[in-house]
């Protein structure tokens, strides 16, 4: 579960994130698994560690292998593995399957192709996009933030799309390319404004002091896979990671479940050892997609012990 495949091309930048996540304040140590040798953090090295990120600037075929990252906090250590493969550049135009990121599907109404892994890099818009190695031209193609939008999608738009961008590290520029297949499907799915099934708006949840409590934020977003949906919890309007209370953590539910044919996501908020001060907080379940954001607020109340009247 905590192993991740990463791949890149020689002489391009490759940045890999540790599969184990932690707060930015936690230290992350990286090792080359075969030798247990520590990876340096000094940026003058071609391969160096930078917190949760392992950077190959640029990558070489010999860098291929398994890398270990250990996230260290004052109370625990978490270990993850990055399986890195660096390939030689192909002389012809064909992109082999092993260099392909996940296939995305589009339709007349929804034709966004995301540039894979781009968020790991220090890049500047706009992106360059290619289809089957040809630079995309014409008003139907719009490079927009980290994705390509194709207007009036047709079946002929199916194919392999490559995004190309420049990663900048301390003034030095490195090229990065990433390719994924795009398929065109008949419009069967649809998205709608998020509908939060739980919790109810302004719900009061009874909890026992000293016990554990779980709150589930569950929302549905439409029919078919909803690539652009998200659910999360906030405390007093603040992200859980920012709130800084280790007793309170959120955990993703299964990636996508289906209810009455609708695609739904859920996020569980786990509160360990409920304290009095937890009753003072505002718990917001947020659900969002391209249509917008919906918020339901929950408050906790102390569960009264059952009165036994004689």
């Amino acid at each position: 579960k905590f192993s991740k495949q990463s791949w890149g091309l020689e002489n391009e930048a490759l940045i890999v994130r540790c599969p184990r996540q932690g707060k930015p304040s936690y230290t992350v140590d990286w090792y080359y698994s075969q030798t247990n040798k520590s990876i340096p953090t000094q940026e003058r090295n071609r391969v160096f560690a930078s917190g949760q990120l392992l950077k190959f600037l640029p990558a070489a075929v010999a860098d291929s292998g398994i890398y270990t990252c250990i996230v260290r906090s004052p109370t625990f250590n978490r270990t993850g593995y990055a399986n890195v493969t660096i390939y030689k550049k192909q002389s012809d135009c064909n992109v082999p399957d092993y260099l392909m990121y996940s296939t995305v599907s589009g339709s007349e109404k929804n034709s966004k192709i995301y540039c894979p892994t781009i968020d790991l890099y220090n890049w500047t818009a706009p992106l360059e996009w290619f289809k089957n190695c040809q630079a995309l031209q014409g008003s139907r193609y719009r490079a927009h933030k980290s994705f390509l939008v194709i207007d009036n999608v047709m079946t002929e738009d199916a194919g392999d799309y490559t995004c190309k961008f420049i990663h900048n590290e301390n003034g030095a520029n490195y090229s990065v390319t990433a390719t994924r297949s795009f398929t065109v499907k008949d419009e069967q799915g649809f998205s709608l404004f998020p509908v939060i099934g739980a919790p109810a708006q302004n719900e009061i949840k009874e909890v026992e002091i000293g016990k554990n409590a779980n709150l589930t934020c569950s929302a549905c977003f439409g029919k078919g896979t909803q690539f652009l949906a998200a659910v999360l919890w906030q405390l007093n309007g603040t992200k859980i990671t920012d709130f800084g209370e280790p007793r309170i953590q959120q955990e993703e539910g299964q990636n996508q479940s289906f209810s009455n044919g609708l695609a739904c996501l859920d996020m569980v908020l786990r509160i360990a050892d409920v304290k009095e001060e937890d009753l003072l907080l505002q718990y917001d379940c947020l659900a969002l997609n391209l249509h917008g954001l919906r918020r339901h607020t929950v408050r906790l109340s102390r569960k009264n012990p059952i009165d036994h009247h004689s």
């Epitope: 540039c115 968020d119 818009a125 690539f227 998200a230 659910v231 917008g292 954001l293 918020r295």
Partner: antibody, heavy 129, light 107 residues
Framework: QVQLVQSGAEVKKPGASVKVSCKAS????????ISWVRQAPGQGLEWMGR????????VYAQKFQGRVTMTRDTSTSTVYMELSSLRSEDTAVYYC??????????????????????WGQGTTVTVSS | DIQMTQSPSSLSASVGDRVTITCRAS???SSWLAWYQQKPGKAPKL??????NLQSGVPSRFSGSGSGTDFTLTISSLQPEDFATYYC????????TFGQSTRLEIK
């Protein structure tokens, strides 16, 4: 409580560059993007661009492309905005603002930005010969 | 770029009045609209995000509505501290764009 503290006022000559800093305290620096917004005297708000402190990735408004550079120093929780080839119309108050965002579950590279909820106090930059 | 047009550009009202400011986008932005309040010499303050969600700590007399291209900010009962300049802002696509402002003055 998160705070953004900006560097002091600057007076520059046309053609020069200015670098404004924005230091974050009291929160997780890397979990939010930082936008830069400027306001010329008596005018409205103008978005210049955004930097993701986690990755260092930037998006700039076309108007400033080639003249603006946004960088960050994670060790000091500081972001910087440098504007070059200054002209008199760049005279303005420059604000940094925390841009609240959420990543899509199945497309973690795609972010929704839905409000700049914490702002710096502003840095006045005057361009005059 | 998406153009944001606010109306009116200025407005005079009295304490206790109900006030409405509108914002129109040049194309659909779904519900990705925020409202800000700015007082002279100060940084803007977020009031409403995602069209209708009240930011934490903002009085409930402020409310937002709308989707697509037409949006409204309503102040149900004006208070003396509400006299300021208001901006709408879309975050549907980059570049982020703001409305040209509405100045709310005391009548």
């Amino acid at each position: 409580q998160v705070q953004l503290v900006q560097s002091g006022a600057e007076v520059k000559k046309p053609g020069a560059s200015v670098k404004v800093s924005c230091k974050a305290s009291g929160g997780t620096f890397s979990s939010y993007a930082i936008s830069w917004v400027r306001q010329a005297p008596g005018q409205g708000l103008e978005w210049m661009g955004r930097i993701n402190p986690n990755s260092g990735g930037t998006v700039y408004a076309q108007k400033f492309q080639g003249r603006v550079t946004m960088t960050r120093d994670t060790s000091t929780s500081t972001v910087y905005m440098e504007l070059s080839s200054l002209r008199s119309e760049d005279t303005a108050v420059y604000y940094c603002a925390r841009d609240t965002s959420i990543a899509a579950r199945l497309n973690p590279d795609y972010y929704y930005y839905y409000g700049m909820d914490v702002w710096g106090q502003g840095t006045t930059v005057t361009v005059s010969s | 770029d998406i153009q944001m047009t606010q109306s009116p550009s200025s407005l005079s009202a009295s304490v206790g009045d109900r006030v409405t400011i509108t914002c129109r986008a040049s194309q659909s932005i779904s519900s990705w609209l925020a409202w800000y309040q700015q007082k002279p010499g100060k940084a803007p303050k977020l009031l409403i995000y995602a069209a209708s969600n009240l930011q934490s700590g903002v009085p409930s007399r402020f409310s937002g509505s709308g989707s697509g291209t037409d949006f409204t900010l309503t102040i149900s009962s004006l208070q003396p501290e509400d006299f300021a300049t208001y901006y709408c802002q879309q975050s549907y696509s980059t570049p982020v764009t703001f409305g040209q402002s509405t100045r709310l003055e005391i009548k």
